[in-house]
């Protein structure tokens, strides 16, 4: 029998610097948890502890904090090099800037393979991109060597920017013939490293033939054996045991997100590449374990620049921008238009002639709205003045609901109205009329939304069964504020790009903006 | 560092057979194939065939088969190819190369073979 | 079994040229395609791998490019030792098959 230990992260999302339990900024430090420095630590343990081991990611390392939005994933090759990766998949975020995006920081830099199956360029970028990423991967590990096969979301034209000579094709029909070609190259050890989401890796566990072990990403999906270390409540055992369709047990791993866990799998492969026995845990990486020296010593370096970049101007303000919550949770208000304006523009993706977009609609919990901007200092709108709006560090997420769960969700955003309280949506594409004369959960007498299948985007009454598109903050898709429906309800969820990172992109392409109070959200006369 | 060491020049007869050796040293034997490339004087590159050490597994040309026997021995670390029945067509510089996924990232010397009556 | 062509059999260039070497597989063979060097002493090294990644210890003035059936190998400053011999050669489908060889001359 030879044993292989699998080291595996997913969706960290630019944690290069420790951050606090929920994954947003550390404040006290001997209470933070994550970073590269302490992952390090903790790798070269086990790298010296153990003689065949593999550090693989799994996708989604771009978006989530200032260091990203300044180094734009020259951070992460830097870093990912530095502690050694074996491999990566590419995951939706890798194109968040474009292919040009990835090509140059990542890609070009990166002394690991950064592998997909599924990803197929045609036109003038297959030259451009060809043999810059794999779909496969061979890696000697001791006396053996090991299969890696690449995967990323086909959904990835919808939640990115790949352009249009990028096809992303079916995961499942993409990884069998390179599978295959594997197996003629004589290797009987094989990962599919991906990032599709858990139901896609259970499924490429089930429908794959000769893939040995699953490794993903996308749903942050958090899988634990035993009492958890932490706050995230387990979603199954770790591994997450899949019976293919040829009568093998296939285990499936994922390490919940932002460099949090470090996913550790221990495999068991008989002489012909059968898995034996599998087992592990994702390991919390809090503050026993200390942080490398000198990897912090490089984080420190490289954070002077984000210091500078923070107070530097992005755009001009000539209005005031009302983020105050006498107005946010009472009203509709110009800095909730202008966070959701921001937000549906950075969904734009004309993927279809059909569409004029895939998403026209915005919904914002005026409670997530924290500060105010000022336009009488010169206009100025700094990174800086963006962290007071949005402190939390959160996403800015595209769900699937029905017209039913919308209907549900403007019913709460005023059940308890006055009290100035979170929920109070703020809106982008939804032109919404409360009653506020009527009792709770019955408030809403009018509920109009903007069509994405016409030419001439104009408003419709909302369609209790049709299922639309919306763009929301994560915290109201997790159910925050009250918001069970939408976390119950939703038919698909997939993370998106840092909300403050969101705002300053859009601040820094309008140049000068004015949002202003338009009429999205009226109360009948009489009631208010 | 790795290293493909081919055995030395060979001088044969018209029916004869012969065989050649591809020492390596430099990487784990066993975890690549070891390929072998056939080149006529002032012609370009013929692949033979190759073999996996690890399983002894092996995959030819079909214009090879019943011309070129590959073999190795694991405990030397060492790749071999028989070639029977000589002819004039023979002769030709063999090389060795090994290969792990995608490409022979490293080739052997060459070993030149006349075939001459 | 694909078959690769190298149309240019030989090349004249001067120090410092850009010099770029084409190849054409007679069916798609999904970048799978190498690049091989191979010198006047018969001495075979790898170049570059699956289109355009750059074998190691290869000099960054080689690059490669291509998809389909269509590729090429640039050589951005040609230097004396760059004199040799170029083979393409795919490894998508089994029989693995070589270019007929594009031979570079300094002019």
């Known amino acids: 029998a030879w044993e292989l230990t699998i080291l595996h992260t997913n969706d960290v999302h630019s944690r290069l610097e420790q951050t606090s339990e929920d994954s947003s900024k550390c404040v006290n430090a001997s209470r933070c948890m994550g970073g590269v420095a302490r992952l390090f630590t903790k790798v070269q343990q086990i790298r010296r502890a153990e003689p065949n081991v593999l550090l693989l990611d799994a996708g989604d390392q771009y978006q989530g904090t200032i260091w990203f939005t300044v180094y734009k994933g020259a951070e992460v090759a830097h870093f990912m090099n530095a502690l050694r990766y074996d491999a990566m998949a590419l995951g939706n975020h890798e194109f968040d800037n474009g292919v040009e995006g990835l090509i140059e920081p990542l890609l070009k830099e990166a002394k690991f393979p950064i592998l997909s199956a599924n990803i197929k360029a045609k036109g003038p970028l297959a030259s451009q991109i060809s043999g810059l990423y794999l779909p496969y991967k061979v890696l000697p590990v001791g006396d053996e060597v090991v299969g890696i096969v690449g995967y990323t979301s086909k959904e990835t034209p919808f939640l990115s920017n790949p352009g249009t000579n990028l096809v992303f094709e079916d995961e499942i029909t993409a990884l069998q013939p390179e599978v295959d070609k594997l197996k003629t190259l004589n290797v009987n050890k094989i990962i599919a490293l991906g990032h599709s989401g858990f139901e896609m890796d259970k499924l490429i566990a089930q429908k794959v033939r000769g893939v040995d072990v699953v490794v993903g990403g996308h749903s942050n999906t958090f899988l634990y054996t035993g009492n958890p270390p932490s706050k995230e409540v387990p979603a199954g055992k770790y591994p997450f045991i899949v019976t293919s369709d040829d009568g093998r047990k296939v285990p499936v791993v994922q390490a919940y997100a932002f460099g949090k866990y470090l996913g550790y799998l221990k495999i068991e492969f008989d002489e012909r590449g059968n898995v034996i026995s599998s087992h592990g845990n994702p390991i919390l990486l809090n503050s026993s374990i200390p942080e490398d020296p000198s990897i912090k010593a490089d984080i420190n370096k490289w954070r002077i620049k984000l210091d500078n970049y923070s107070t530097q101007e992005l755009g001009k303000t000539i209005v005031y921008l009302d983020g105050s919550s006498q107005s946010c949770r009472f009203r509709e208000c110009n800095m909730g238009n202008l966070i959701c304006d921001a937000m549906i523009n950075n969904n734009l993706r004309h993927t279809d002639e059909m569409f004029w977009n895939h998403v026209s609609m915005c919904i914002l919990n005026g409670g997530g709205i924290r500060s105010p901007i000022d336009e009488r200092n010169n206009g100025t709108i700094t990174w800086e003045n963006l962290a007071a709006v949005l402190p939390f560090g959160g996403t800015f997420d595209l769900v699937q609901l029905k017209g039913s769960t919308l209907k549900k969700a403007f019913e709460h955003s005023v059940h308890r109205y006055g009290q100035s309280t979170g929920e109070f949506l703020q809106v982008g594409g939804i032109h919404v009329v409360y009653d506020l004369s009527r009792k709770p959960g019955d408030r809403v007498v009018k509920l109009d939304v903007l069509c994405t299948k016409c030419r001439v985007p104009s408003y419709d009454p909302l369609k209790m069964d049709e299922v639309y598109k919306v763009i929301l903050p994560n915290f109201l898709a997790n159910g925050g504020d009250g918001f069970q429906m939408i976390k119950d309800e939703l038919l698909r969820h997939d993370s998106g790009d840092q909300d403050i990172n969101v705002v300053s992109t859009y601040i820094s392409k309008m140049k000068v903006i004015y949002p202003a109070v338009e009429g999205r959200i009226k109360f009948s006369t009489g009631s208010h | 560092e790795v290293q493909l060491q081919q055995s030395g020049t060979v001088l044969a007869r018209p029916g004869d057979s012969v065989k050649m050796s591809c020492k390596t040293s430099g990487y784990t034997f066993t975890t690549y194939w070891m390929h072998w490339v056939k080149q006529r004087p002032g012609q370009g590159l013929e692949w033979i065939g190759a073999i996996y050490p690890g399983n002894s597994d092996t995959t030819y040309n079909q214009k090879f088969k019943g011309k070129a026997k590959l073999t190795a021995v694991t405990s030397a670390s060492t790749a071999y190819m028989k070639l029977s029945s000589l002819t004039n067509e023979d002769s030709a510089v063999y090389y060795c190369?090994?290969?792990?996924?995608?490409?022979?990232?490293?080739w052997g010397q060459g070993t030149s073979v006349t075939v001459s009556s | 079994e694909i078959q690769m062509t190298q149309t240019t059999s030989s090349l004249s260039a001067s120090l410092g040229d850009r010099v770029t070497i084409s190849c054409r597989a007679s069916?798609?063979?999904?970048?799978?395609l190498n690049w091989h060097q191979q010198k006047p002493d018969g001495t075979v090294k790898l170049l570059i791998w699956?289109?355009?990644r750059l074998h190691s210890g290869v000099p960054s003035r080689f690059s490669g490019s291509g998809s389909g059936t269509d590729y090429s190998l640039t050589i951005s400053n040609l230097e004396q030792e760059d004199i040799a011999t170029y083979f393409c050669?795919?490894?998508?489908?089994?029989?693995?098959?070589f270019g007929g060889g594009t031979k570079l001359e300094i002019k």
């Open positions: 190369t090994r290969l792990l996924d995608y490409a022979m990232d490293y």
């Open positions: 069916q798609d063979i999904r970048n799978y």
């Open positions: 050669q795919q490894g998508n489908t089994l029989p693995w098959t």
């Open positions: 699956y289109t355009s």
